[in-house]
Each structure stands twice: as structure tokens, then as C-alpha cells.
């Protein structure tokens, strides 16, 4: 697994460097998670042909993965810092069950999958400190999550491979949109 942000050799070599601001720390954290997703996608794509699957086949999957929409205030038109931050945190909380599903889906990248999951938890904490309106953030229901996890794990092999691919792809896109918006804040 890659070294968590703030622990690479560059940081050790420059002990007198200014500490990271909260925005820089969040930026670095998201890039770290994106690196992890890249590694996981590599294993997924090497193992199956899901990455070449047509969009039609992907669309048939009824996963309810978080996605940025215009109303979320994270795009330039209608950009709203607080609404967007709430959407990012809510979306990340909703992704947690899917990241849990990924935990037993990798052979050579088991550690990497764990790192992505744990780093996402840390990212959520960073973002919650930044948010003013924590009341607007809805936490997913644990019972609903548990039954969703059971349902996903009961799928046949092909659907499990497809689900893994979709989760990684959607999570990557969600993080990219989130970081682009956070860079405006």
C-alpha cells in the first residue's frame, strides 16, 4: 500500500516546511485515495474484461451509487460552498458500505483496499471539521447498509466483478468532482 499522506520521504527530508493547511491536507488525502483506487482498478481490469464493458451493460446494474448533480452546488453553475460540502460528506458516508464490500474482493491488493477504506474515514473527519452545517448531513441507516451488503455478496461471480468495477469507477469520479469543487472553496 502507498504511504499515507504526510509520511513520505519528502516530508521527512524537509522538517522545517510549513505545516499543511486544512485545505492542503484534504487535497493530499483525496489524491492519496485516488492513487489507491488506480491500483485497485488495475487489478480489476487485469482480472476481468469489465473495464471494456459497454456503457449499456453498466447502466443495467441497479446500484444506487452517489453521484454529483447540478443541484448539489458542486459545479460552476449554481456553485454553493455549504450545499456542496454537505453533498460531498453525505456521498462519502454513502460510499462506505460499498468500500466495505470491496474488502474481500482483491487478492494482491488486499492492503490497498483497506487503505482506501481507512483513508476515506479520515477524509470524512477532515471534511466534517470544515463543514458549518453538520445537521444537514444524513448518515446512512446501518440496518439498510447491512442488508445491502448481504445482497451484494450474494450475487453471482460476474455481477460481483461488475459491482466491484462500478464502485471503483463511481468512487473515482465522485472524488474527482469533489476535489475540483473543494479547490474553489
Amino acid at each position: 500500500a502507498p504511504v499515507p499522506p504526510g509520511e513520505d520521504s519528502k516530508d521527512v527530508a524537509a522538517p522545517h516546511r510549513q505545516p499543511l493547511t486544512s485545505s492542503e491536507r484534504i487535497d493530499k488525502q483525496i489524491r492519496y485515495i485516488l492513487d489507491g483506487i488506480s491500483a485497485l482498478r488495475k487489478e480489476t481490469c487485469n482480472k476481468s474484461n469489465m473495464c471494456e464493458s459497454s456503457k449499456e451493460a453498466l447502466a443495467e446494474n441497479n446500484l444506487n451509487l452517489p453521484k454529483m448533480a447540478e443541484k448539489d452546488g458542486c459545479f460552476q453553475s449554481g456553485f454553493n460552498e455549504e450545499t456542496c460540502l454537505v453533498k460531498i460528506i453525505t456521498g462519502l458516508l454513502e460510499f462506505e458500505v460499498y468500500l466495505e464490500y470491496l474488502q474481500n474482493r482483491f487478492e494482491s491488493s488486499e492492503e490497498q483496499a483497506r487503505a482506501v477504506q481507512m483513508s476515506t474515514k479520515v477524509l470524512i473527519q477532515f471534511l466534517q471539521k470544515k463543514a458549518k452545517n453538520l445537521d444537514a448531513i444524513t448518515t446512512p441507516d446501518p440496518t439498510t447498509n447491512a442488508s445491502l451488503l448481504t445482497k451484494l455478496q450474494a450475487q453471482n461471480q460476474w455481477l460481483q466483478d461488475m459491482t466491484t468495477h462500478l464502485i471503483l469507477r463511481s468512487f473515482k469520479e465522485f472524488l474527482q468532482s469533489s476535489l475540483r469543487a473543494l479547490r474553489q472553496m
Epitope: 489524491r31 485516488l34 454529483m68 474527482q176 476535489l179 475540483r180 479547490r183 474553489q184
Partner: nanobody, 124 residues
Framework: QVQLQESGGGLVQAGGSLRLSCTVS????????MGWFRQAPGKEREFVAD????????WYADSVKGRFTISRDNAKNVMYLQMNSLKPEDTAVYYC?????????????????WGQGTQVTVSS
């Protein structure tokens, strides 16, 4: 990293149009976020616009909003900047940039590959 090459710059009268192209070498073009920056004589390089991998997240600097349009063709490995209603203050060297994380943003530090630039001169 990828190689970037801008083209399409030139001399144009105020109110005219130009289309800049940025050709990218490398198979991973479609995963990159791409941006346009510009640098006027004696000024800092500034953000113009950026576009994500599938063109559904586009940002513009306030100074060009409504006049410039950024787009990309992933099949051809090219990004474009359509510039309409050009003003003398748009005179600058225009650079294209690529972000391998697929994010982009308004600061130079967010991009890891840069082109050499193409000159755009708008005369009054």
C-alpha cells in the same frame, strides 16, 4: 506524463474569433483533466478554463465566461478553446495543461504536464 502541443494562435482584430487546439500524445488522454492558462506580458500566468475527462464538469475564469468555450475530443486526443468576442486584454501566450489525477483547478500546481504555449494577439 504526456506531451502537449498548442496550435491555432495568431493575430486577430477585437471582436474576432480564434480556436486554439491542444494535441496530446499518450494513450491515457481520456483520463486526464485538461486546462487552459494564459500569460500576458509582464503578468503572472492565469487560469482560463478547465474540463474533466468526460466534459461534464467545466469551469471558466470570470473574465472569459460567456465568450470562451472549452471542449475536448477523447477519440482524437485533442482539447480546444473556442474564443469569441476577443478583446485586446485577451492578448497573451496561451498554454494547455494536463492533470493526471483527472481533477484540474485554477492553480498551476494542480497540473503535471504543460505545453510550450501559442501566442494570441488581439489588436484594437
Amino acid at each position: 506524463q504526456v506531451q502537449l502541443q498548442e496550435s491555432g494562435g495568431g493575430l486577430v482584430q477585437a471582436g474576432g474569433s480564434l480556436r486554439l487546439s491542444c494535441t496530446v500524445s499518450g494513450r491515457t488522454f481520456s483520463t486526464y483533466a485538461m486546462g487552459w492558462f494564459r500569460q500576458a506580458p509582464g503578468k503572472e500566468r492565469e487560469f482560463v478554463a478547465d474540463i474533466n475527462w468526460n466534459s461534464d464538469n467545466i469551469w471558466y475564469a470570470d473574465s472569459v465566461k460567456g465568450r470562451f468555450t472549452i471542449s475536448r475530443d477523447n477519440a482524437k486526443n485533442v482539447m480546444y478553446l473556442q474564443m469569441n468576442s476577443l478583446k485586446p486584454e485577451d492578448t497573451a501566450v496561451y498554454y494547455c495543461a494536463a492533470d493526471s489525477y483527472g481533477v484540474g483547478g485554477g492553480k498551476e500546481e494542480y497540473y503535471d504536464s504543460w505545453g510550450q504555449g501559442t501566442q494570441v494577439t488581439v489588436s484594437s
